[in-house]
């Protein structure tokens, strides 16, 4: 529990401290206070760097002091022989003695009290962006008129965030434009259009004047556009350095304007509008798109028709065409569907004949039926040659999809009859 | 076959053997057998065999047996109470529809049907081949296939021959243009047991082929002249019957 004051004594004080001890004390005063630690008695075996016996004062990771030997006060009106002032509310005191003492040493007596710290002046880093106000046990920040204190209770800024723009066209400017924008502010503007429309931002060079970058090229004040995982900027300087037309490919755009404490300029003004999301004209082999356009945008519907001999297979069913819609994400629906060569499948068997085994059963492939000669012949003509047609059928020039018919050859004996002379 | 020679089934791959009654037939396509009406009038479910030269029981077991689905007798064939006393063999033609198609090969293949043109009108002296397992000079039934080549003769030659064992007056026997008379040379003739077999004539338009000009029907006396059903006169009936009783697989 934090305390406002306390006493720390070496073991057995005021008797001699024992050999081989290590003891530590964790001092904690309330938040917002520092610690004043002072020693009124110090009698510890002296050694170089206090290597044998010592009392150590540690604040966080820093060693504030290491004491040994005998000390007496320099001031006859004060009993303090050594003192430490830390602007933190925690401190650790560690006492160590080694295995032997040449003489009898009585150790130390120390006291601590909680002291007020002036957060506004005692630290290198100023805690407030504008006005700092100290009080016992703490401080608070305050802001000039027109500014408000941010949630971090340290920084002041102007109220320039939270605007959401949903209209398909609009104009956005930095606070006070064309008067100088406020320092130390983060302005966030959100453009949220209907899905299927991309935000297009247009800026004129002369409508942009933001504190220039430092010598390392880092913008001190910056304008950034964020669309999903894509970022445009940061931009700064006199005259807009980016593209005058920014196609975000997104229906959602966040505009972030960040300023530091110094160097305010007139700021910026931009226009935006919503363009229907374009879909790229994809290369779909063996097909034609209807209607044919130079550019396709959100909600456009095309019929993709396969060329003769090609089909789109969906769920193991073949079709000659399919519809694709330009979606809100700039991608085509049914984009996985492709026109592939028609497969006529394994040719049917015929009675008393055979079909040569096809090397391929795809569009354009050719097969030949033959009859079991010399006992059968092809009755219905056509020559027996079939090709895989665009409709998925094996087709003959003469018979169409009708299969050849192998019928018996009649009236031909395998061996002629010879009368035996008697 | 009287006065014939031994033959091999490869000489007559269309030859069909009927075992009851002992007779013949001609295969005309995968599903149909052409025979004489008098062969099937008494047995509408005949057992038939193809592809074997010998009709020995052991050989038949290895040959192809044909199962009939239906027998179609020509509507002009007069059915009698006592077929043995028949004197009218007009329209002696029938078709047997098979249950299953016959697989063709060197020992089984059909004979052609005559065309309808005048090219297929027979002239006296035109030669035809007959084959069968019927009576020979030596035995009642042949075990191995016999065949003979004989000429077409004028119908009067058949009329002039005295019927050997008449069952009626000689004048009672009917002779019509639906019959072909053939034989009379070297005693070569068809006989009992050869009925229904083809009288095969060389196709006038394709010398490599034979067509069934006639079917062994009847005769006054074995070894003289014989009468054969004139198939040309029945081609329309044959085609119509086959068409009306075919399966889609044949169409």
């Amino acid at each position: 529990e934090p305390t406002m004051y306390g006493e720390i004594l070496s073991p057995n004080y005021p008797q001699a401290y024992p050999s081989e001890v290590e003891k530590s004390w964790d001092i904690e005063v309330p938040e917002g206070y520092g610690i004043h630690l002072y020693f009124t008695h110090l009698d510890i075996e002296l050694s170089e760097n206090c290597a044998y016996d010592s009392v150590q004062i540690i604040s966080g990771d820093t060693e504030e002091g290491r004491l040994c030997g005998q000390r007496s006060s320099n001031n006859p009106h004060s009993p303090i022989v050594e003192e430490f002032q830390v602007p933190y509310n925690k401190l650790q005191v560690i006492f160590k003695s080694d295995f032997s003492n040449e003489e009898r040493f009585t150790g130390f007596a120390a006291y601590y009290v909680a002291t007020d710290i002036n957060e506004c002046t005692d630290f290198v880093d100023v805690p407030c962006s504008h006005f700092c106000n100290n009080f016992i046990g703490g401080y608070f920040c305050s802001c000039p008129p027109e500014y408000f204190l941010h949630d971090d209770m340290k920084n002041c800024g102007v109220n320039c965030s939270g605007d959401v723009f949903t209209a398909l066209i609009g104009e956005i400017a930095s606070p006070n434009y064309p008067k100088p924008y406020p320092e130390n502010s983060r302005c966030e503007y959100q453009i949220r259009l209907e899905k299927g429309f991309q935000v297009v931002v247009t800026l004129r060079r002369e409508d942009f004047d933001v504190e220039a970058a430092d010598s390392a090229g880092n913008c001190l004040d910056s304008l950034v556009f964020v669309a999903g995982d894509r970022q445009f900027g940061p931009y700064c300087g006199h005259g807009f350095p980016g593209p005058l037309n920014i196609e975000t490919k997104s229906n959602a755009l966040d505009i972030i304007f960040q300023t530091d404490l110094t160097g305010q300029k007139k700021g910026w003004k931009l226009r935006y509008h919503g363009d229907p999301m374009p879909c790229p004209k994809e290369d779909t082999p063996n097909s034609v798109w209807e209607p044919a356009k130079a550019k396709y945008v959100f909600r456009d519907v095309v019929q993709i028709t396969c060329l003769d001999g090609f089909e789109v297979v969906e769920g193991r069913v073949g079709a000659t065409s399919f519809y694709s819609t330009c979606q809100s994400n700039g991608k085509w629906s049914n984009s996985k569907l492709k026109c592939q060569p028609v497969d006529c499948g394994i040719p049917e068997s015929i009675e008393n004949g055979k079909v040569e085994d096809p090397e391929s059963t795809l569009f354009g492939s050719v097969i030949r039926y033959t009859c079991e000669e010399p006992y059968y012949y092809m009755e219905n003509g056509g020559g027996g040659e079939y090709h895989c047609a665009g409709n998925g059928s094996w087709v003959n020039e003469v018979l169409g999809p009708e299969l050849p018919k192998c019928v018996p050859v009649c009236g031909v004996p395998r061996e002629p009859f010879e009368e035996k002379q008697r | 076959i009287i006065g014939g020679s031994d033959a091999d089934i490869k000489n007559f791959p269309w030859q069909v053997f009927f075992d009851n009654p002992w007779a013949g037939g001609a295969l005309i396509n995968e599903y149909w057998v052409l025979t004489a009406a008098h062969v099937v009038e008494g047995n509408r479910e005949p057992t038939m065999y193809v592809g074997s030269t010998s009709v020995q029981t052991s050989r038949l077991a290895k040959s192809k047996m044909l199962t009939p689905e239906h027998v179609f007798i020509h509507p002009g064939w007069k059915l009698l109470e006592v077929p043995e006393g028949r004197t009218n063999f007009d329209n002696d033609i029938a078709l047997v529809r098979l249950k299953d198609p016959v697989k063709m090969g060197p020992t089984v293949s059909p004979i052609c049907l005559p065309g309808t043109s005048s090219d297929y009108n027979l002239m006296d002296g035109d030669l035809g081949l007959i084959s069968g397992w019927g009576r020979t000079e030596k035995r009642d039934r042949a075990v191995r296939l016999k065949a003979a080549r004989l000429p077409v003769a004028p119908l009067r030659k058949c009329k002039e021959v005295k019927v050997e064992k008449p069952t009626a007056d000689a004048e009672a026997y009917v002779f019509t243009p639906n019959m072909i008379c053939a034989g009379g040379e070297k005693g070569m003739d068809s006989c009992k047991g050869d009925s229904g077999g083809a009288f095969a004539v060389q196709d006038p338009n394709d010398k490599t082929k034979f067509y069934a000009a006639g079917l062994v029907s009847w005769g006054p006396q074995c070894g003289t002249y014989g009468l054969y059903t004139r198939v040309k006169n029945y081609v329309d009936w044959i085609m119509k019957t086959m068409q009306e009783n075919s399966t889609p697989r044949e169409d």
């Epitope: 069913v317 497969d343 499948g345 394994i346 055979k354 085994d357 096809p358 | -």
Partner: antibody
Framework: EVMLVESGGGLVKPGGSLRLSCAAS????????MSWVRQAPGKGLEWVAT????????YELDSVDERFTISRDNSKDTLYLQMNSLRAEDTALYYC???????????WGQGTLVTVSS | QIVLTQSPATLSLSPGERATLSCTAS???????LHWYQQKPGKAPKLWIY???NLASGVPSRFSGSGSGTDYTLTISSLQPEDFATYYC??????????FGQGTKLEIK
């Protein structure tokens, strides 16, 4: 007479392999495309694979595509089904069938039983 | 893939009655490639009707088939004791897979 006789079935553990054979007779085997069809106990028919007459073109059911291979040896008038990585759901009576007009299966074997169980 | 649905799953009728078995395809099937099979317990299936309406060899004329597009029917005009069996419809489509219906069991009432 057309005859198809399957063999090679039996009991096999999951992950195991079997090779089914189908001996054909009574027709010119090399003239016909052939198929394997299976029937799980008490269930309906399920097509498994098809092979063209010469064996160059095959189609297999998606669920067995990587595991089963249909093949044929026309010199031996025999159809085969090599089954690897067998699963319990492959348990069935496997029939071979001849494909005829319009890919109707006009002749079937009597079937061979494959049981996949640990 | 084309799914074939047969109805009813079981049909209970008496000999002499008329039987109507239905097969419905999930998408249009060519009537040339729609076939029916008969299967009796413990036996292999037999091709019964091919290309929608053609009776296979040995199938009695009391059987008939009809249909087009997605709806197909097998009809038995007057049931005989030997007709009680399971009937499967089957379609072939070049893109595969070949599919069968789940079967209709025709049983004696």
């Amino acid at each position: 007479e057309v005859m198809l006789v399957e063999s090679g079935g039996g009991l096999v553990k999951p992950g195991g392999s079997l090779r089914l054979s189908c001996a054909a007779s009574g027709f010119t085997f090399s003239n016909y495309a052939m198929s394997w069809v299976r029937q799980a106990p008490g269930k309906g028919l399920e097509w498994v694979a098809t092979i063209s007459s010469g064996g160059s073109k095959t189609y297999e059911l998606d669920s067995v595509d990587e595991r089963f291979t249909i093949s044929r040896d026309n010199s031996k008038d025999t159809l085969y089904l090599q089954m690897n990585s067998l699963r319990a759901e492959d348990t069935a009576l496997y029939y071979c069938a001849r494909l005829f007009t319009k890919h109707a299966m006009d002749y079937w074997g009597q079937g061979t039983l494959v049981t996949v169980s640990s | 893939q084309i799914v074939l649905t047969q109805s009813p799953a079981t049909l209970s009728l008496s000999p002499g009655e008329r039987a109507t078995l239905s097969c419905t395809a999930s998408s249009s099937v060519s009537s040339s490639y729609l076939h029916w099979y008969q299967q009796k317990p413990g036996k292999a299936p037999k091709l019964w009707i091919y290309s929608t309406s053609n009776l296979a060899s040995g199938v009695p004329s009391r059987f008939s088939g009809s249909g087009s597009g997605t709806d197909y029917t097998l009809t038995i005009s007057s049931l005989q004791p030997e007709d009680f069996a399971t009937y499967y419809c089957h379609q072939y489509y070049r893109l595969h897979p070949i599919t069968f219906g789940q079967g209709t069991k025709l049983e004696i009432k």
